[in-house]
Amino acid sequence: ETDEESEEPGRRGSFVEMVDNLRGKSGQGYYVEMTVGSPPQTLNILVDTGSSNFAVGAAPHPFLHRYYQRQLSSTYRDLRKGVYVPYTQGKWEGELGTDLVSIPHGPNVTVRANIAAITESDKFFINGSNWEGILGLAYAEIARPDDSLEPFFDSLVKQTHIPNIFSLQLCGAGFPLNQTEALASVGGSMIIGGIDHSLYTGSLWYTPIRREWYYEVIIVRVEINGQDLKMDCKEYNYDKSIVDSGTTNLRLPKKVFEAAVKSIKAASSTEKFPDGFWLGEQLVCWQAGTTPWNIFPVISLYLMGEVTNQSFRITILPQQYLRPVEDVATSQDDCYKFAVSQSSTGTVMGAVIMEGFYVVFDRARKRIGFAVSACHVHDEFRTAAVEGPFVTADMEDCGYNIPQTDESTLMT
C-alpha cells in the first residue's frame, strides 16, 4: 500500500549534505540558507509550501539584518515589472528580476530563477525571525502577478537533472527557544530531489495532490481521541485543504473548528481553561515539568489514499498542537498557546501538523507522503502515528469544488 519499493532510481537513499539544513521554530517559520547573485549574497529564506514566489528583502528594513543588493550582482537581470502581494494582514511589494541562485546545504547546482525584490512591506518580516525572504514551493497557478512567473522549484527541475520531488522534516523544539538557542538549534531538513530514510520511522503513506496550485489534499474523516467528529466530510475540505509549512497552526473551517474544540474541551474537562486559550490568544502555564499531556486528546486526520476506497490516518499529539511560548513573567514555567485555530479559507495543515511527520512532496507523481518524523516531540505513553489502510467509501465526494469566477463562467 505504501508504494515505497516502486520509487525510481535517484529517489532513495541518503542526502547527508542536506540533513539539518533548516533552522527556526514553528511560531516564526523555518528557513534555509540560500545565495543569490554574483558574487553570491547569503540570505536566510523561509520555506513556504503555501505560496509560489521567491521573494527577498531588497531594501533596508528595521527587522532585516541584511538584504539583497541587486546593484552588486553582475548576473542580475531586471524584468521591468512590479509585483504586489496583499495578505489578510500585511503585504509586500517589489520588482521582478532574475539572478543566479543556489542552496549551499542543498544540491550542488546553480540556477537562474525569478526573484521578487521586496522594496516595501507591511507586517511581513518578523522581528527576530532571522529570515530575509521567502521561498514559495507551491505551483505556478498561485504565483504573483500571474502563473507565467515560473516558481523556483520548477526552474530548478527544468535546468538540472534533479528529480521533481522534495521532502521536509520540521522539528519542533518542544520548549520555547530564546534568540541564541534558536540560532544554535537544529530546525530540521529540506531534502531536495528525494527522500532521506534516516528522517522517518515506519512507512510512508501517500495521499493524492488533488490539484496543482496549493498542495491540496482531501481529508475524509477527523477524530479526537478516536471519537469521530461525524461531519459531512465536505466540511473538512471547505473550501480546500492544504499542506503549508509557512503557517504555524492547524487551521480548520469554522464549523469543524467549533466541533473539534468542543470535543477537545470535553476530553480535557478536568481543567477549565479560559476562553481566550481556545481562541489561541491566551497562554496557559504549568509549573516546570508538570504539563499534564495525558489530559489532552490526540487528533487524527484521515487522508484519501492512493487506492480506491482506501484511506490512512495521521495522528498528532498535544505536544504538536500546544505551542510552547514564553514571556518575561513566566520564564520559570512551561507555557503554551493552543495552536488549532479557525479558518475562512479551508483547512491548513501548518507547522504543528508537519512537526509530527516527515512530509514528502512528490510532485512527479502528484502525491504527498507522510511518515512519523524521527524528530517529533512525544512522551513515554503516546507517539505521533501514520497508520492504514482504512476502508472509506465515496472519498471523491469529500472534495469541495470552488465555484469558478473567470470570464468563461460569466458567459450567458
Epitope: 481543567e271 481553561f273 479560559p274 481566550g276 486559550f277 491566551q282 496557559v284 504549568w286 508538570t290 513573567a329
Partner: nanobody, 124 residues
C-alpha cells in the same frame, strides 16, 4: 474577558513619589499573584515587585526599601507605592496577574495576563 486597568503613572522630580494601581476584572477564577514589571526604552522588561495570594512579596534589588507592593483582595486590585524615585526608574510600568485555572481554581495551572502599561517619568 479579563481586563486590567492601570493608573497612577506620570511625571515627577527625583526624590518624589507615585502610587500605581491596577484593577483586574472580568473573571471568576482565583488570583494567584499580581505583579508590576517595567520596561525602559531599548531594555528588556523586568520584574519590579510581585505579591502572591498568600500575601508573600518579592522585590527587585534596585527598588528594595523604596517601593512597596500591596493588594486589596476584595477589589482585585494591586498597588505599587513608589517612594524616593530616581531617574533610572523612568519606564513603562506593566501590571501582570496570574489567574488560577487548575482544579477548583488552584494555581497549579495559571493563565498570565498583561495590562497596557502606564508611563512613569522621573526627571533630575
Amino acid at each position: 474577558q479579563v481586563q486590567l486597568q492601570e493608573s497612577g503613572g506620570g511625571s515627577v522630580q527625583a526624590g518624589g513619589f507615585l502610587r500605581l494601581s491596577c484593577a483586574a476584572s472580568g473573571y471568576t477564577y482565583s488570583t494567584c499573584s499580581m505583579a508590576w514589571y517595567r520596561q525602559a526604552p531599548g531594555k528588556e522588561r523586568e520584574l519590579v515587585s510581585s505579591i502572591r495570594n498568600d500575601g508573600s512579596t518579592a522585590y527587585a534589588d534596585s527598588v528594595k526599601g523604596r517601593f512597596t507592593i500591596s493588594q486589596d483582595n476584595a477589589k482585585n486590585t494591586v498597588y505599587l507605592q513608589m517612594n524616593s524615585l530616581k531617574p533610572e526608574d523612568t519606564a513603562m510600568y506593566y501590571c501582570n496577574i496570574r489567574i488560577g485555572v487548575g482544579p477548583g481554581g488552584t494555581c497549579s495551572i495559571y493563565a498570565p495576563y498583561w495590562g497596557e502599561g502606564t508611563q512613569v517619568t522621573v526627571s533630575s
